[in-house]
């Protein structure tokens, strides 16, 4: 008789999840020789322990603590790039600008990027059929709690000028409910962070509006200013040209506004 299984609204655990996490860990430690000391089996065991046999709507930051203490690494605190709803461009940028880091350029972020996972209460099985959706099912699911936990600590590490890439094509360019808006903004340390600089990425080719005047950007400025952190904003009208100019800053066309 097949065992009854809770049906959630979100997609199930990414196929070959354990193998993927372990392989990513090994790859990361090979790419970053300073991380050679990391024991990837211990990392996987700690990751697995956070959600296996636990109700996927009852996950806490506490569950991830054994994982959170692993993989200590050095990220220059003045080279942190946050992003919201524009991950691909942010990652393309740090692939070119190698001295800047998104959360997904760190070990824990790299392990979990684009993956989904959850378990089931009282069984050691991974649920490959469905996992809770943040809106439709519950917010305390394994994936959401993981990103909240690592995002908080990443933001706490930032100093000097912190950059954030925002998607100018969305109705809410700054969304208070995003991980950036609900976690990272509130965990920047005012005694260390001097300025938050927003880069608003334009979508349309002919879009010449100043999206830094958008009401949601003004809302972000207000939140940041109240935390005694300065705020600045730049329009990136041509993201393709922007990336090209990061690659080749000497190019004559890169002196004009991008």
């Amino acid at each position: 008789v097949p065992r009854w299984r809770q049906q959630w609204s979100g997609p199930g655990t990414t196929k070959r999840f354990p193998e993927t996490v372990l392989a990513r860990c090994v790859k990361y430690t090979e790419i970053h020789p300073e991380m050679r000391h990391v024991d990837c089996q211990s990392v996987w065991d700690a990751f697995k322990g956070a959600f296996i046999s636990k109700h996927p709507c009852n996950i806490t930051e506490e569950d991830y603590q054994p994982l959170m203490k692993l993989g200590t690494q050095t990220v220059p605190c003045n080279k942190i790039l946050l992003w919201s709803r524009i991950k691909d461009l942010a990652h393309q940028f740090t692939q070119v600008q190698r001295d800047m880091f998104t959360l997904e350029d760190t070990l824990l972020g790299y392990l979990a990027d684009d993956l989904t996972w959850c378990g089931e209460f009282n069984t050691s099985k991974i649920n490959y059929q469905s996992c809770p959706d943040w809106r439709k099912d519950c917010s305390n699911n394994p994936v959401s709690v993981f990103w909240k936990t690592v995002s908080r600590r990443f933001a706490e590490a930032a100093c000097d000028v912190v950059h954030v890439m925002l998607n100018g094509s969305r109705s809410k360019i700054f969304d208070k409910n995003s991980t950036f808006g609900s976690v990272e903004v509130h965990n920047l340390q005012p005694e260390k962070v001097q300025t938050l600089e927003a880069w608003v990425i334009h979508g349309g080719r002919e879009d010449s509006r100043d999206l830094c005047q958008d009401p949601t950007i003004k809302e972000l400025e207000s939140i940041i200013s109240k935390r005694n952190i300065q705020f600045s904003c730049k329009n990136i009208y041509r993201p393709d040209k922007f990336l090209q100019c990061v690659k080749n800053p000497e190019d004559s066309s890169c002196t004009s506004e991008i």
Epitope: E61, P66, M68, T72, T74, R153, A157
Partner: antibody, heavy 120, light 108 residues
Framework: QVQLQQSGAELARPGASVKLSCKAS????????MQWVKQRPGQGLEWIGA????????TYNQKFKGKATLTADKSSNTAYMHLSSLASEDSAVYYC?????????????WGQGTSVTVSS | QIFLTQSPAIMSASLGERVTMTCTAS???????LHWYQQKPGSPPKLWMY???NLASGVPPRFSGSGSGTSYSLTISSMEAEDAATYYC?????????FGGGTKLEIK
């Protein structure tokens, strides 16, 4: 603002014990190792041990096993160090310090220190 | 266990002078995990530099760090009065941790 507030100076007799506290604020206490460091007058820094409040994991410098006992109370965001069988060589300033996860394990915030004097 | 030896133990420099102090490890250390602290009398140490060359928040840009393997250094391009202090190097490792013996920098 991140702060580590340590308890006040202690004067103790040889053979006695003391419990020092370090109250953390301004960050998520659970997700950072808390380190303890000893400094004798006019001397350098000596590592005692560390505790990870998130899961209670503890690691000690072999030299201080049996001398120092580390604990943490997550509900009050406070780390403790119990020093037993005090002797004159335990007279020192003891610091708690937070290990910065993205700072390569460097100690990015320090308490003001607690002075322990052992004297008969 | 890796030991860190700092040299010189004590040094003095005139205002405006370039200052370099070294930290030598008994065996190779990853540059990502070699850190420096500044301590002044009566105060706790302060994180000064992390991962060999990254300045901690608020540290003046006249400070720089370099090195790899077993040899690391902290340099002040132009000594200022407020730089007089003791500097400790430190190697991160889960256990045991090690600090160097310190270099005391005085004003000549």
């Amino acid at each position: 603002q991140v702060q580590l507030q340590q308890s006040g100076a202690e004067l103790a007799r040889p053979g006695a014990s003391v419990k020092l506290s370090c109250k953390a604020s301004g960050y998520t206490f659970n997700t950072y190792w808390m380190q303890w460091v000893k400094q004798r007058p006019g001397q350098g820094l000596e590592w005692i041990g560390a505790i990870y409040p998130g899961d209670g994991d503890i690691t000690y410098n072999q030299k201080f096993k049996g001398k120092a006992t580390l604990t943490a109370d997550k509900s009050s965001n406070t780390a403790y160090m119990h020093l037993s069988s005090l002797a004159s060589e335990d007279s020192a300033v003891y610091y708690c310090a937070r290990e910065g996860y993205y700072y390569g394990g460097a100690l990015d915030y320090w308490g003001q220190g607690t002075s322990v004097t052992v004297s008969s | 266990q890796i030991f860190l030896t700092q040299s010189p133990a004590i040094m003095s420099a005139s205002l405006g002078e370039r200052v370099t102090m070294t930290c030598t490890a008994s065996s190779s250390v990853s540059s990502s995990y070699l850190h420096w602290y500044q301590q002044k009398p009566g105060s706790p140490p302060k994180l000064w530099m992390y991962g060999t060359s990254n300045l901690a928040s608020g540290v003046p840009p006249r400070f720089s760090g370099s090195g790899s393997g077993t040899s690391y250094s902290l340099t002040i391009s132009s000594m200022e009065a407020e730089d007089a202090a003791t500097y400790y190097c430190h190697r991160y490792h889960r256990s045991p941790w090690t600090f160097g013996g310190g270099t005391k920098l005085e004003i000549k």
